[in-house]
């Protein structure tokens, strides 16, 4: 047969669906790999073919579209499960072809079991909301296309295992869940269960969003260097170990890149001949403010090392900060080298 453009296994699309729930999966070819959409391809005489490889098997096999109640069907560029079964897990391939052209891509589909409290191996999207902000809304995700707009599904929201009824600052409004003046105690997994009828059957869609309450933009600041500071002097004798922590506080800023680095006499540690070790640790507050500590250490400090200028630098999207460490040789009356 003719050569086929094989895009391989698209592991970027790790599709997870819950067992015993409907699932609609679009062929990724038209979303990520080809410049035209399904309608254009179809009107050009191209056919979309589906097949799959079961979990822990190597054999590709056609998908059985003749199951009872049309459990698996194809509609345009969508593969439908009404509903999924655990053993539907595997790698699915969609192939677009005619007599002269062929393009295909595979993607993994995992059917996941959940317990009565919605606990599962499913990876949930994270929604960050600002603390004390007025109103935040989250919307039940990935339910578009499952039922026509004429159908009004019932929606029930849960926090963890508890149905959201009379929560003081969390209000269910159909597909939306509103948070009024959120606090850290609003952190958690929020699940919407959407129930809709189709051909005399009731189907359930379960979707979970992890809510994380973070620091507000109004509280965002440039980095604050706690250490080194002007109050602490690092007084050492030659041969002793010199340890200077650079401890920096970064308020939470969405998508900010927080940096901390040392310079020695204006150069990066890698560019000086001193035998320096730098260890970094990071801790987070409840609102994802970050404290980043870089410890600079010299095992056996020399008189020359004790005359160098050690400066801690920090940067985020709000600005920069720097602070020199006060280093001196024990017995010396000043930080400047003595001239005899």
């Amino acid at each position: 047969s003719e050569r086929c453009d094989d895009w391989g296994l698209d592991t970027m699309r790790q599709i997870q669906v819950f067992e015993d729930e409907p699932a609609r999966i679009k062929c990724p070819l038209f979303e990520h790999f080809l410049k035209y959409n399904y309608s254009t391809a179809h009107s050009s005489g191209l056919t979309l073919i589906w097949y799959w490889t079961r979990q822990d098997r190597d054999l590709e096999e056609p998908i059985n579209f003749r199951l009872p109640e049309n459990r698996i069907s194809k509609e345009k560029d969508v593969l439908w499960f009404r509903p999924t079964l655990l053993n539907d897990t595997g790698n699915y391939t969609c192939m677009l072809r005619n007599t002269t052209y062929c393009s295909k891509v595979a993607f993994p589909l995992e059917v996941v079991q959940k317990d009565s409290c919605f606990n599962s191996a499913m990876r949930f999207p994270v929604h960050k909301m600002y603390i004390e902000h007025g109103i935040h809304k989250i919307t039940c995700p990935n339910v578009d296309g499952y039922f026509p707009s004429s159908v009004k599904p019932s929606v029930t929201w849960y926090k963890g295992c508890t149905e959201i009824v009379d929560f003081h600052n969390v209000l269910p409004e159909g597909m939306n869940l509103s948070f009024f003046i959120p606090l850290v105690s609003n952190n958690g997994n929020y699940t919407c269960v959407v129930t809709y009828p189709e051909n005399g059957r009731l189907f359930h869609l379960t979707r979970t969003v992890t809510v994380k309450v973070v620091g507000s933009p109004k509280d965002a600041l440039p980095p604050q260097i706690y250490s080194p500071n002007d109050r602490v002097v690092y007084e050492k004798e030659p041969g002793e170990e010199l340890v200077i922590p650079c401890k920096v506080y970064f308020s939470f800023i969405m998508d900010s890149h927080n940096e901390v680095w040392w310079t020695i006499d204006g150069k990066k540690p890698d560019d000086v001949t001193v035998d320096i070790t730098i260890n970094e640790s990071v801790s987070y507050s409840s609102t994802e403010d970050e404290t980043r500590t870089q410890i600079l250490s010299i095992k056996k400090v020399t008189p020359e090392d004790l005359r160098r200028n050690y400066v801690c630098h920090a940067r985020n999207t709000k600005g920069e900060a720097e602070q020199a460490a006060k280093v001196k040789q024990k017995g010396n009356g000043c930080t400047e080298p003595m001239t005899l």
Epitope: E132, H133, I135, F180, I181, L183, S185
Partner: antibody, heavy 118, light 107 residues
């Protein structure tokens, strides 16, 4: 210096209305959530209502929900509490208080007395 | 709603002595607990926030401890100006709730 100054209290008949104001100064008013807390004569403190720094989010104690409305005007550095359908049990000193999640109610006004009586 | 229970209702202490006030929450409030002092005819004043951090200008004789459901305010050596009513308040969950107060009086 942070200052919160309540006004608008007084004697009102049951079923009547009153509007309290709280004038803020000495800080960036628009950066803080604001609250009303009340204290009935000889009793403890009761949180009444909160409004977010941007004015969009409001919350109320069940005892006043549907009767009281909190609002703010950040351009005037002023917090308001519109109280309708007042009852005898709403008699209290009403305090406005500044709130930050990190520091709780760190500043309070001196209070204004609301008396609901026929 | 989280119920805050303070004990004792009244504490009789001599000046210079230590006073220990308790506050219990009906469910965990993490460390989101504050203590306030109120004198007759005055507004409450913040003493402690975050269960253990002293507010600006509060003397070191005031200290707070605890997390979760059990909290303590300690006044190490009572001064004459410390005789007042003390309230705990949780700000972990809406609605925010106060304890009923502990009155510290002169013995």
């Amino acid at each position: 210096e942070v200052q919160l100054l309540e006004s608008g209290g007084g004697l009102v008949q049951p079923g009547g209305s009153l509007r309290l104001s709280c004038a803020a100064s000495g800080f960036t008013f628009a950066e803080y959530a604001m609250n009303w807390v009340r204290q009935a004569p000889g009793k403890g403190l009761e949180w009444v209502s909160a409004i977010s720094y941007d004015g969009e989010g409001t919350l109320y104690a069940d005892s006043v929900k549907g009767r009281f409305t909190i609002s703010r005007d950040n351009s005037k550095n002023t917090l308001y509490l519109q109280m309708n359908s007042l009852r005898a049990e709403d008699t209290a000193v009403y305090y406005c208080a500044r709130f930050r999640y990190y520091t709780a109610f760190d500043y309070w006004g001196q209070g204004t007395l609301v008396t609901v009586s026929s | 709603e989280i119920v805050m229970t303070q004990s004792p209702a009244t504490l009789s202490v001599s000046p210079g002595e230590r006073a220990t006030l308790s506050c219990r929450a009906s469910q965990s409030v993490s460390s989101n607990l504050a203590w306030y002092q109120q004198k007759p005819g005055q507004a409450p004043r913040l003493l402690i926030y975050g269960a253990s951090t002293r507010a600006t200008g509060i003397p070191a004789r005031f200290s707070g401890s605890g997390s979760g459901t059990e909290f303590t305010l300690t006044i190490s050596s009572l001064q004459s100006e410390d005789f007042a009513v003390y309230y705990c308040q949780q700000y972990n969950n809406w609605p925010w709730t106060f304890g009923q107060g502990t009155k510290v009086e002169i013995k």
